[in-house]
């Protein structure tokens, strides 16, 4: 078999909401992946496990069950939403993320995804980590190219 | 340290109005929410609503919407509770109380005002 | 609104025997951001009420270590491992998980 590629594009949006009181953050990141099987048979997308990590702790989770099918040859553009929470011992950054004397509050998150990819009864995955810049105070929508950027902040491997 | 202070005693008019005081200390008064809290003779806790002295948003318990008006005064650190068309019903001790960091519970209470309507 | 049901409702308890209070609402207090909002008060006779526990567990400054809470979801149990003369007094647990915030009805400590 050749090989499945998974490519993690980037962030595509983030929506923020707040809870004052309780000095909570809730963003809801969707991210974009292309998925190409180089194969000359189909390849089934099993699933799509994701989280997302904010200063080494685990912010969100999210899981995407039976996907997609990709054709010979084919590339896929699969888009999946990680709703992500920061309270409690992180609720600092509410003051930070709320802060009405800047325009731009960019907080550095983590972005971990696997692919579970099936053919012919054999399942594969598929892993890939990648720093993100996200604004935690608007909601934005993002250019898919301009968080390439971002592989600077890739520790080397 | 933190204080909370409230005065003991309001004698009231069925039908009238009265406005509650609680003056902080202590602590920034701006960084954590005030709560309002019900106690009858004998009874239980009811909670009234809260307030954010930064902005004066407020979260409203619905029992009690068209009761209590809740407002804060920054340049005095005071908080302030107006309850309007009182009836024997609202004869009780009415408590504020200043949320934690993370405005869940209630570490800090004033002494309480003693409500009493009668005519 | 959630309602809180605590019990029992008068508990006689001989010094230093330990006490169990139970709490129970009526929906989950599990918060959408995974933190459970529950919390216990005393209040002693002409006084105002005193946060013993937050967060289900968590001790407030000052607050001696016989005093601990536990529990999840609905259910959640406040325990006095030795109960002393100062212990004596009306306990609520309350929530702050959903508006409007809610008390339980109280359970009064009392001696045999």
């Known amino acids: 078999p050749r090989s499945i590629e998974v490519k993690y594009i980037g962030v595509k949006s983030a929506y923020v909401s707040y809870d004052a009181e309780k000095r909570t953050i809730y963003l809801n990141i969707t991210n974009t992946l292309n998925i190409t099987n180089n194969n000359y048979y189909s390849v089934e997308v099993e699933n799509i496990t994701a989280q997302v990590q904010f200063s080494k702790t685990v912010i969100g989770k999210a899981r995407l069950n039976n996907i997609t099918n990709i054709g010979p040859l084919d590339m896929k553009q699969i888009d999946y939403t990680v709703p992500t929470v920061i309270a409690e011992e992180m609720s600092y950054m509410y003051d930070f993320c709320t802060l009405l004397s800047i325009k731009v509050h960019n907080i550095v998150l983590m972005m971990q995804v696997t692919v579970t990819t099936a053919y012919f009864g054999h399942s594969e995955q598929i892993s890939q980590e990648r720093y993100q810049y996200v604004d935690c105070g608007r909601n934005t929508t993002y250019q898919l190219a301009q968080s390439e950027y971002l592989n600077v902040l890739q520790p080397q491997q | 340290q933190v204080q909370l202070q409230q005065p003991g005693t309001e004698l009231v008019k069925p039908g009238a109005l009265v406005k509650l005081s609680c003056k902080a200390s202590g602590y920034t008064f701006t960084t954590y929410w005030i709560h309002w809290v019900k106690q009858r003779p004998g009874q239980g806790l009811e909670w009234i609503g809260n307030i954010n002295p930064s902005n004066g948003n407020t979260k409203n318990n619905e029992r009690f919407k068209t009761k209590a008006t809740l407002t804060v005064d920054k340049s005095s650190s005071t908080a302030y509770m107006q309850l309007s068309s009182l009836t024997s019903e609202d004869s009780a001790v009415y408590y504020c109380?200043?949320?934690?960091?993370?405005?869940?519970?209630?570490?800090?209470w004033g002494q309480g005002t003693l409500v009493t309507v009668s005519s | 609104d959630v309602v809180m049901t605590q019990t029992p409702l008068s508990l006689p308890v001989s010094l230093g025997d330990q006490a169990s209070i139970s709490c129970r609402s009526s929906q989950s207090l599990v918060h959408s951001n995974g933190i459970t909002y529950l919390h216990w008060y005393l209040q002693k006779p002409g006084q105002s009420p005193k946060l013993l526990i937050y967060k289900v567990s968590n001790r407030f400054s000052g607050v001696p270590d016989r005093f601990s809470g536990s529990g999840s979801g609905t259910d959640f149990t406040l325990k006095i491992s030795r109960v002393e003369a100062e212990d004596l007094g009306v306990y609520f647990c309350?929530?702050?998980?959903?508006?409007?915030?809610?008390f339980g009805g109280g359970t009064k400590l009392e001696i045999k």
């Open positions: 309350s929530q702050s998980t959903h508006v409007p915030y809610t």
């Open positions: 109380v200043r949320g934690d960091y993370y405005g869940t519970s209630y570490p800090f």
